[in-house]
């Protein structure tokens, strides 16, 4: 009559949780039985991120630190079931924690847009294209941002139109701009759950041009033309 190792009730164990669960939340549990009826002690192996703890008696698994989907999902650890007493035989299974993305990163500009300019005076309304991004995982659908002007007072001078889920066009509504810098506030909404909004500023300079670049006194950089 050979002593047998504990047997897990399932091939593997999985649990889906939101990445923003509170520390101390029960995120799953594992169960095993010992063929000889001995008690079982559970432990975890390979918890490299230090996110989890297991109740040695019940097999319940709890979070002990903030979870972050962007670190990679599913998060996989080994669970060990060991006989208490007897030959202390053990078995190994796996617990996979599937982290469901929480929309926790507001949209922002994809790059540095300083240095945008139009040659003054405008001969016709002008436009420029900009790109938004965020740091959430979009599960290969890609972000779907919507764009609007950040304040009502801007609507006399500017309009913003969506090109696709990440790009938009900022256009002047007329040609009567002063020779100075305008800061255009753009509201970007990510349409997530919950929806997050970022208000970004695009500084646009209207300046006298020499050979297609902003003329600046000595010591000032020439600006790149995004016309």
């Amino acid at each position: 009559d050979v002593n047998e190792a504990p047997q897990f009730s399932q091939h593997v164990f999985q649990a889906k949780v939101s990445e923003d669960v509170a520390i101390g939340t029960k995120v799953g549990n594992v169960t095993a039985k010992d063929p000889e009826g001995l008690d079982i002690s559970y432990s975890l192996r390979g918890d490299t991120r230090g996110w989890l703890k297991i109740d040695h008696v019940t097999g319940e698994i709890f979070s002990v630190a903030p979870l972050d989907r962007e670190a990679g999902s599913p998060y996989r650890v080994q669970v060990v079931a060991t006989e208490v007493g007897g030959s202390s035989l053990s078995s190994v299974s796996e617990f996979h924690l599937i982290l469901m993305d929480v929309n926790d990163n507001p949209p922002r500009l994809a790059k540095d847009y300083t240095g945008l300019f139009f040659c003054h005076p405008l001969s016709a309304p002008g436009s420029l294209i900009f790109e938004a991004t965020d740091d959430d995982q979009h599960l290969f659908r890609g972000p779907h941002f919507t764009f609007s002007l950040g304040s009502g007072s801007l609507q006399n001078d500017w309009e913003v139109s969506k090109i696709n889920g990440t790009h938009a066009r900022l256009s002047t509504r007329h040609t009567e701009f002063e020779e100075r810098e305008y800061v255009v506030l753009i509201r970007i909404n990510d349409g997530g759950r919950p929806p997050l909004e970022g208000i970004v500023s695009l500084p646009v300079t209207f300046c006298s041009c020499v050979e297609g670049s902003c003329f600046r006194p000595a010591g000032h950089k020439h600006h790149h033309h995004h016309h």
């Epitope: 399932q10 091939h11 593997v12 999985q14």
Partner: antibody, heavy 116, light 107 residues
Framework: QVQLVQSGAEVKKPGASVKVSCKAS????????MHWMRQAPGQGQEWMGY????????EYNQKFKDRVTMTRDTSTSTVYMELSSLRSEDTAVYYC?????????WGQGTLVTVSS | DIQMTQSPSSLSASVGDRVTITCRAS??????LAWYQHKEGKSPKLLLY???VLADGVPSRFSGSGSGTDYTLTISSLQPEDFARYYC?????????FGQGTKLEIK
């Protein structure tokens, strides 16, 4: 990148044995269980069993329990599946696959033909 | 053993169509379910796991739903590269078993 490269096609006579290899690269070999499946002509996928490379623990489908042996060589990151007492109905494409939730990487398959 | 029954066994559709394949387990598998795409002469490709979670690199036109014993794979707008055979598979306990497959053909 993760790759599972299997040995080449085999032709065997009934009653013989075949040993198929699966060499893993691009990840920590000992960290993932390796499963074996097969697909006979015109049939669906059939699970044969798995090996845990870190512990050498194996579990087999009862259907193959007396005829299949899975082993591993950690020095070469290779797992092996040997099937004995071959019969014509063992003619199939044999696949190794890395276990996660489901099988996220598969070998290219090895055709084993059993014919007299 | 847990039996996995897929339907339909074959399906003809056109590019742009919405397609649904169902998979029924002989007992509760608690969303321990994966879906695969298998093209002739190639290895199977994991599409979804845990019934609803897209595997890395899989286009968002693929989605999964279901719980308990009944599960569904949906392709929202068929693309030419989607014509293949599709399998469900449970990984709840051994022996792991697959559905018999659904062959998706171009109409």
């Amino acid at each position: 990148q993760v790759q599972l490269v299997q040995s080449g096609a085999e032709v065997k006579k009934p009653g013989a044995s075949v040993k198929v290899s699966c060499k893993a690269s691009g990840y920590s070999f000992s960290s993932y269980w390796m499963h074996w499946m097969r697909q006979a002509p015109g049939q669906g996928q059939e699970w044969m069993g798995y090996i845990n490379p870190s512990t050498d623990y194996t579990e087999y489908n009862q259907k193959f329990k007396d005829r299949v042996t899975m082993t591993r060589d950690t020095s070469t990151s290779t797992v092996y599946m040997e099937l004995s007492s071959l019969r014509s109905e063992d003619t199939a494409v044999y696949y190794c696959a890395r276990s996660r939730l489901g099988f996220d990487y598969w070998g290219q398959g090895t055709l084993v033909t059993v014919s007299s | 053993d847990i039996q996995m029954t897929q339907s339909p066994s074959s399906l003809s559709a056109s590019v742009g169509d919405r397609v649904t394949i169902t998979c029924r387990a002989s007992e509760n598998i608690d969303s321990y379910l994966a879906w695969y795409q298998h093209k002739e002469g190639k290895s199977p490709k994991l599409l979804l796991y845990a019934a609803t979670v897209l595997a890395d690199g899989v286009p968002s036109r693929f989605s999964g739903s279901g719980s308990g014993t009944d599960y569904t794979l949906t392709i929202s707008s068929l693309q030419p590269e989607d014509f293949a055979r599709y399998y469900c598979q449970h990984y709840y306990r051994t022996p792991l078993t697959f559905g018999q497959g659904t062959k998706l053909e171009i109409k």
